[in-house]
């Protein structure tokens, strides 16, 4: 996350890390005891969970193993529509004031909705400084017409956009997969950006998860 | 300072395989930030991107020579190599590696510019 | 495939001058287009990266614009050593990244 802060300790309980051996690969968030939402390029053979801590790394979090994970059939890693990926857990997490699950949206939010993103993604570009507490940022919803002036036809249908016009606060590599919650519902998966992270009225680029909701809630039912 | 060198032999006979090795001096090939990028040129002529491959070994081959290209990475010795069989004339150029840096974060990572170059090892086809 | 069209091939001009090159995407590429410079022998240098981003150590009289299909590389004030040949390479919707024809600089 660059230009965000120090997130309030335990209030992101949902914010999960994907783990390549002990390094970060990838945020995540958690929306059943069994399973956990992230970003479609975030595909990896296997992955470590963290959950329940604030603090990258730290030995007291709960870790467990994912051996499966199911892209959304959609995924193009040419246009990168449905950049959208749960991951099934080995074996079921164990709930707790620092370890809830997200609530999935009923309705997609409008443009002007005040949300928060998070992750322990480089905090400075191009140079990197992987933080080991997690990060945050306000940012506010872009509508569709207002993203397509910067990003033009690489923006997709269900790809949403948040920024703070003439800020640099944005998100960055490590954050993918992470979660955007607005009014308290998880409204987007950090996808994509341009590099250096954090140029001013470059708006971040999240999948829009109000549109896939369908879809995870029978991908997770199909794969109990 | 991060070095690209080509190494290999400059003459290959048709329908044989060309060989080459990129060798990195002052970085690591094992960074996920970045592609490991082939590209050539022919005698006179403008850039042609053969091929690239990332941190995870996978790769991504220009259509035109798909068929005959294979590119590898040996993260203990800190090269990435590329082969290119059944060689003819056309094949005649200059072989550059060289570091491709991400232009985008996430999704986008695979948008990229090539920062570093190796100097160029010419390679000629002929019997 | 996206071709990318370069304008002109060559061109002269005299140390001082300004000169501008274009490079037209056949479809939409966004502002993911980078500039390069090639001395005869020697290895292409990266210019300009997202179409407009200087690179690190490169001169201030160079500078580029455009965004969608069509892009400008500028050069303020032609310099002795900025005699050379100069592509433009657009990096999404690989493979295969693609590059343009090349434009060559020279001394008028």
């Known amino acids: 996350i660059i230009d965000g802060y120090k997130c309030k300790e335990g209030s992101h309980p949902w914010q999960v890390a994907l783990l390549k051996g002990n390094q970060l690969h990838c945020g995540g968030v958690l929306v059943d005891k069994y399973w956990v939402l992230t970003a479609a390029h975030c595909k990896m053979g296997q992955y470590q969970v963290q959950l329940g801590s604030d603090k990258i790394g730290d030995q007291s979090a709960q870790k467990i193993k994912a051996t499966k994970s199911f892209r959304h059939p959609g995924y193009s890693t040419k246009t990168h529509v449905n950049d959208i990926m749960l991951v099934r857990l080995d074996e079921p997490v164990k709930m707790s004031s620092k370890v809830e699950a997200v609530q999935l949206p009923e309705h997609c939010e409008p443009p002007g909705t005040s949300c928060t993103v998070s992750g322990w993604g480089t905090t400075t570009s191009p140079d990197v400084t992987f933080p080991s507490d997690l990060m945050c940022s306000d940012v506010k919803l872009i509508s569709s017409r207002e993203c397509k002036k910067v990003y033009k036809d690489l923006l997709g249908k269900t790809m949403l956009c948040a920024g703070i016009p003439d800020s640099k606060t944005n998100t960055c590599n490590g954050d993918s997969g992470g979660p955007l919650v607005c009014n308290d519902t998880l409204q987007g998966l950090v996808s994509w950006g341009t590099y250096p992270c954090g140029q001013p009225n470059d708006p971040g680029v999240y999948t829009q998860v109000c549109k896939y909701k369908r879809w995870v809630m029978e991908t997770m039912k199909t794969h109990r | 300072q991060l070095q690209l060198q080509e190494s290999g032999p400059g003459l290959v006979k048709p329908s044989e395989t060309l060989s080459l090795t990129c060798t990195v001096s002052?970085?690591?090939?094992?960074?996920?930030?970045?592609?490991w990028v082939w590209i050539r040129q022919p005698p006179g002529k403008g850039l042609e991107w053969i091929g690239s491959?990332?941190?995870?070994?996978?790769?991504y081959y220009n259509p035109s020579l798909k068929s005959r290209v294979t590119i590898s990475v040996d993260t203990s010795k800190n090269q990435f190599s590329l082969k290119l069989s059944s060689v003819t004339a056309a094949d005649t150029a200059v072989y550059y590696c060289?570091?491709?840096?991400?232009?985008?974060?996430?999704?986008?990572?695979?948008?990229?510019?090539?920062?570093?170059w190796g100097q160029g090892t010419t390679v000629t086809v002929s019997s | 495939d996206i071709q990318m069209t370069q304008s002109p091939s060559s061109l002269s001009a005299s140390v001082g001058d300004r000169v501008t090159i274009t490079c037209r995407a056949s479809?939409?590429?966004?502002?993911?287009l980078n500039w390069y410079q090639q001395k005869p022998g020697k290895a292409p240098k990266l210019l300009i990266y997202?179409?407009?981003s200087l690179q690190s150590g490169v001169p201030s009289r160079f500078s580029g614009s455009g965004s969608g299909t069509d892009f400008t590389l500028t050069i303020s004030s032609l310099q002795p050593e900025d005699f050379a040949t100069y592509y433009c390479?657009?990096?999404?919707?690989?493979?295969?990244?693609?590059f343009g024809g090349g434009t060559k600089v020279e001394i008028k």
């Open positions: 390479q657009q990096s999404p919707y690989f493979p295969p990244l693609t």
């Open positions: 491959i990332d941190y995870f070994a996978s790769t």
């Open positions: 997202s179409a407009s």
């Open positions: 479809q939409s590429i966004s502002s993911y």
């Open positions: 002052g970085g690591s090939i094992s960074s996920d930030d970045y592609y």
């Open positions: 060289a570091r491709g840096r991400p232009l985008g974060y996430g999704a986008r990572h695979d948008y990229y510019g090539m920062d570093v």
